[in-house]
Interface confidence: medium
């Protein structure tokens, strides 16, 4: 049988044969500096202690140095995302050193065995960094470790073992199984670098979460709540493969973290912004679109360094493909009810009209339920930049599309048979743009007509910059 190293093994693990490695001439961990833009080109293998080779490989001591660390592999080969990331880094940082940490022989194992090898690989990366630090011009502050899946935890071990502090570690959907809830020295954690930023794209509360759910960095960004990524449903992946299986969905969602990072490198003119929020549900309600006190940040390469005392969980919505950027809006709608309507569950849609473009018809996602005689907050997002908003069309969906809705309507009719004319009144909509932080107020076109009922629409025109209205002495509830 095969001996295993536990992630919490002692430093003497160096001297053991890592789990499941065949005794071949190939080094179990190689450091390949990518000098060519051509992914087919082998690059140049660095050798710890060989300064001449460092020179021959064109290593630039004063430039930024990126170490790309792959994760577990069942194929034993580099996946296409790695080449995309290499070329995106080379394009963005022309003078930088881009080093691929090739630990394929140790990663091409049973997942659990690959996990048990992460510590020893982290030690090897730290060893290489310690040797580089002996060179006068080399600065650990210029080092950025980028680890995907298991590679994120390798980066964590490297940052933990290195003498000094690495400038930055980016965790791209750090692996979950065997790391969730682990001690900070046995997984990626904020202590591992001066700045640790993390993208979580495959977290699940049911089944097995392939990506780690817990926050592990200074900032932890959960695109689309960190779970269901647009463009990764079975229907989406079925089109491109002979047999669509859950594995393709897993790969799509897990790997989405890499593509979001690549997007931040190649589409720097279209940065995606994430917003601090305590949880995904509050974000879905549109409560968390504030940029005050470092509450928002760019995602990926352009993330601003934030070393909070507490971990910062951040959320955003994205498109299904590159460029991933969307435009977030918070909508505050005060719903008045003049009739005793009982419990109603209206289905609202909005269309936003702007100086640049008009949005599609967007559903207002009701996370809990519409509160009557209260202000309801919603999150809407558009794929295109609408420019300055001019007007809003609010529609209450009429004819029910499902038997469930028909039943709800029938039930609510039975409870109030003498009041079939269901009606709500909305005088204005307050909108805040996440990307510009601009606040606008929209009033009904006809101040006399503020009522809306199923199958009807209501038009709102911009009536004020900002949110405070005449006769209002205090602002509405502040954003967190």
């Amino acid at each position: 049988s095969i001996t295993t190293l536990r992630p919490q093994g002692s430093l003497r693990d160096e001297h053991h044969k890592p789990t499941g490695v065949p005794a071949t001439a190939r080094p179990s961990v190689a450091f390949n500096i990518r000098t060519s833009k051509d992914p087919e080109q082998e690059g140049c293998n660095l050798s710890l202690g060989d300064s001449k080779l460092l020179e021959n490989c064109g290593f630039n001591m004063t430039a930024k140095t990126f170490f790309i660390i792959h994760g577990w592999t069942m194929s034993g080969m580099f996946e296409s995302w790695l080449h995309k990331l290499v070329s995106a880094l080379q394009m963005r940082e022309k003078d930088a050193n881009v080093v691929v940490v090739d630990w394929l022989p140790l990663a091409h194992q049973l997942y659990t065995d690959a996990v048990n090898n992460t510590r020893v690989v982290g030690q090897r990366v730290a060893g290489m960094l310690d040797w580089l630090q002996e060179k006068e011009e080399f600065s650990l502050g210029n080092v950025h470790l980028i680890g995907y899946s298991l590679g994120a935890h390798v980066a964590g071990y490297a940052g933990n073992f290195v003498k000094g502090t690495v400038g930055r570690i980016t965790g791209l959907d750090p692996a979950g199984p065997m790391f969730e809830g682990a001690d900070i020295h046995k997984r990626l954690s904020p202590d591992d670098a001066d700045f640790v930023d993390v993208l979580h794209t495959y977290t699940r509360s049911f089944g097995l979460s392939i990506g780690i759910q817990m926050p592990v960095g200074h900032i932890d960004i959960y695109p689309n709540g960190g779970d269901f990524q647009p463009g990764c449903g079975l229907n989406d992946v079925l089109g491109s493969i002979a047999y669509g299986t859950i594995t393709e969905v897993v790969k799509c969602e897990h790997e989405r973290a890499v593509h979001l990072f690549v997007d931040s490198l190649v589409n720097q003119d279209k940065p995606s912004f994430a917003f601090q929020c305590t949880d995904s549900n509050r974000f879905k309600k549109g409560i968390c679109l504030s940029c005050r006190k470092n509450r928002c940040n760019s995602i990926g390469y352009n993330a601003k360094k934030m070393r909070n005392k507490r971990n910062s969980k951040m959320y955003l919505k994205t498109r299904a493909g590159m460029p991933f950027r969307v435009y977030h809006y918070q909508m505050k709608i005060h719903v008045f009810s003049y009739k005793n309507m009982g419990e109603i569950e209206p289905t609202f849609y909005v269309t936003l009209y702007g100086t640049n473009a008009d949005s599609q018809t967007l559903p207002l996602e009701i996370v809990e339920r519409i509160e009557q005689n209260a202000t309801n907050t919603f999150l809407v997002y558009t794929e295109e930049d609408l420019g300055d908003l001019l007007k809003i069309q609010l529609t209450w969906e009429g004819a029910s599309q499902s038997w469930y809705n028909l039943w709800k309507e029938f039930r609510s009719y039975l409870s109030q048979p003498r009041n079939p004319g269901r009606e709500l009144n909305i005088r204005r909509i307050r909108v805040k743009s996440g990307e510009t932080q601009r606040k606008l107020t929209f009033c009904t076109e006809d101040p006399e007509n503020t009522s809306i009922s199923p199958g009807r629409e209501l038009w709102f025109r911009k009536c004020r910059d900002g949110w405070r209205m005449k006769n209002e002495t205090s602002p509405t509830v502040e954003l967190p």
Partner: antibody, heavy 119, light 107 residues
């Protein structure tokens, strides 16, 4: 849906060899590892080894490395296990099963092939 | 190799009963514990993976729990079709090993 169809029962003489097959359908063949498991009559299950068609990667249980040889034919989406130098100890039902990544479980099983070694 | 022990090789219960089958590993297996059902005709099915996750299509009366070295499978409301042999398996490290099995029969 995922299916693993195994070859029929075999009656073989001691010292001979036998080749069992496991034909996969309903999923991308090269993306999943196929495992083989042995069950002697009225007994428990023993893991023999795996074959990963994506890279022709093979792992054996130390106990079976001189007994079993795993191969595959990608064109027919079939994984084979050859058992050599058969003895009565090799009389058993042999199952093939598909590995689920990350969880290290066997989510789909073939119906089993009974091998009887008898003079 | 990691030894997997199912102390109860045979278990009798009545329909509607709550049944618990246990499994012990010779070392910590970090929740990499799976449960299989082998029906009388020899068909093998995965029930529970990674200690407590229900495989698709498996009735919710089956549940799993445990950590470290001790794990269990519970059937909350025994039905006729549950009469089978149940095996645990560790997927923590190679070689994968199985428990000896627990044969469940009707009283």
């Amino acid at each position: 849906q995922v299916q693993l169809q195994q070859s029929g029962a075999e009656l073989v003489k001691p010292g001979a060899s036998v080749r069992l097959s496991c034909k996969a359908s309903g999923y991308t063949f090269t993306k999943y590892t196929i495992h083989w498991v042995k069950q002697r009559s009225g007994q428990g299950l023993e893991w023999i080894g795996w074959f990963y068609p994506g890279s022709d990667s093979i792992k054996y249980n130390e106990k079976f490395k001189d007994k079993a040889t795993l191969t595959a034919d990608k064109s027919s989406r079939t994984v084979y296990m050859e058992l050599s130098r058969l003895t009565s100890e090799d009389s058993a039902v042999y199952f093939c099963a598909r590995h689920e990544e990350y969880t290290n479980s066997l989510a789909y099983w073939g119906q089993g092939t009974l091998v009887t070694v008898s003079a | 190799d990691i030894q997997m022990t199912q102390t109860t090789s045979s278990l009798s219960a009545s329909l509607g009963d709550r049944v618990t089958i246990s499994c012990r590993a010779s070392q910590d297996i970090s929740n990499y514990l799976n449960w299989y059902q082998q029906q009388p005709d020899g068909t093998v099915k995965l029930l529970i993976y990674y200690t407590s996750r229900l495989h698709s299509g498996v009735p919710s009366r089956f549940s799993g729990s445990g950590s470290g070295t001790d794990y269990s499978l519970t059937i909350s409301n025994l039905e006729q079709e549950d009469i089978a042999t149940y095996f645990c398996q560790q997927g923590y490290t190679l070689p994968w090993t199985f428990g000896g099995g627990t044969n469940l029969e009707i009283k």
